[in-house]
Interface confidence: medium
């Protein structure tokens, strides 16, 4: 499998403490929208799922930073294509999910890797920890 760490800003959403509580409406609905969005973006067979969605405050707390890990079958996609396909979807994300996306950053994730190799992110990602958000677990609500 190939893993990619992806980070982006949602500039039209306000960060608040509900995004630090995974049992709230705000957290669950945003996670659902993002999961569905990625299933739309990477429809090709190589996409396996995403995990470790994390929400953080953007600059000044006026936006939401989303961080997550994407998994693909080995050799089906590279960093450049992951970023390109995501950037190409930004307009549709705005109209379909009302998410204004900016500051996209994608990087390779060596797998497995230790906490030290992620430079303080503390998001240790291991095979047995993957919590897939797959298509059949989500019902479109738009």
């Amino acid at each position: 499998m190939s893993f990619f760490f992806l980070s982006f800003h949602i500039s039209n959403l306000q960060f608040n403490s509900s995004l630090e509580d995974p049992s709230t409406d705000y957290y669950q609905e945003l996670q659902r929208d993002i999961s569905e969005m990625f299933l739309q973006i990477y429809k090709q067979g190589g996409f396996l799922g995403l995990s470790n969605i994390k929400f953080r405050p953007g600059g000044g707390g006026g936006s939401v930073v989303v961080q997550l890990t994407l998994a693909f079958r080995e050799g089906t996609i590279n960093v450049h294509d992951v970023e390109t396909q995501f950037n190409q979807y930004k307009t549709e994300a705005a109209s379909r999910y009302n998410l204004t996306i900016s500051d996209v950053s994608v990087s390779d994730v060596p797998f497995p890797f230790s906490a030290q190799s992620v430079d303080g992110l503390n998001d240790i990602f291991e095979a047995q920890k993957i919590e897939w958000h797959e298509l059949e677990h989500h019902h479109h609500h738009h």
Partner: antibody, heavy 116, light 109 residues
Amino acid sequence: EVQLLESGGGLVQPGGSLRLSCAASGFTFRVYAMSWVRQAPGKGLEWVSGISETGSYTYYADSVKGRFTISRDNSKNTLYLQMNSLRAEDTAVYYCARYPYGFDYWGQGTLVTVSS
Amino acid sequence: QAVVTQEPSLTVSPGGTVTLTCGSSTGAVTTSNYANWVQEKPGQAFRGLIGGTNKRAPGTPARFSGSLLGGKAALTLSGAQPEDEAEYYCALWYSNLWVFGGGTKLTVL
């Protein structure tokens, strides 16, 4: 002052039902997710169920799924736990807890005893 | 359902430092597990100390801090006080449920 007051516990036979209530005061109840947590006699804590601030999302431990139902009435500042098909292993003190940064405030608990 | 493990008991000297840990049967604990730490003292209501891995609940003394350490969640108590003698429980979030650990009995001696 934040206060959570549980009620509705008691002695019930196996297979019976109980409805627990948790009356909240001292904070804006409708903006907080809430949970029920229990502690069996001489044991540690076990999370039972949780609910999002509007009640749109509910969560259950595997041990109670299909038997317990969590709900809330934000107009009454009250959290509920409907417990059906009770078993001896459900015997415990049941606590309601608020969740913003950790389970920060807890009630004093209500004792549920399931015995014939 | 995942199993969350804690040290059954630990002892610290007054003024000393101690670290309680919280491990997961599914692998390394991450920030996505939103580790929580709860304190239980006899005759008192439970009290949340730390949520979201490292955020202190209102009223939590600064001597308590939360972090991730070696693939586990950790609660560090720096400058232990006699009143810190208690049972400490951690809880981890797994997608749609919380799981508590068995608790650590901390003795200040």
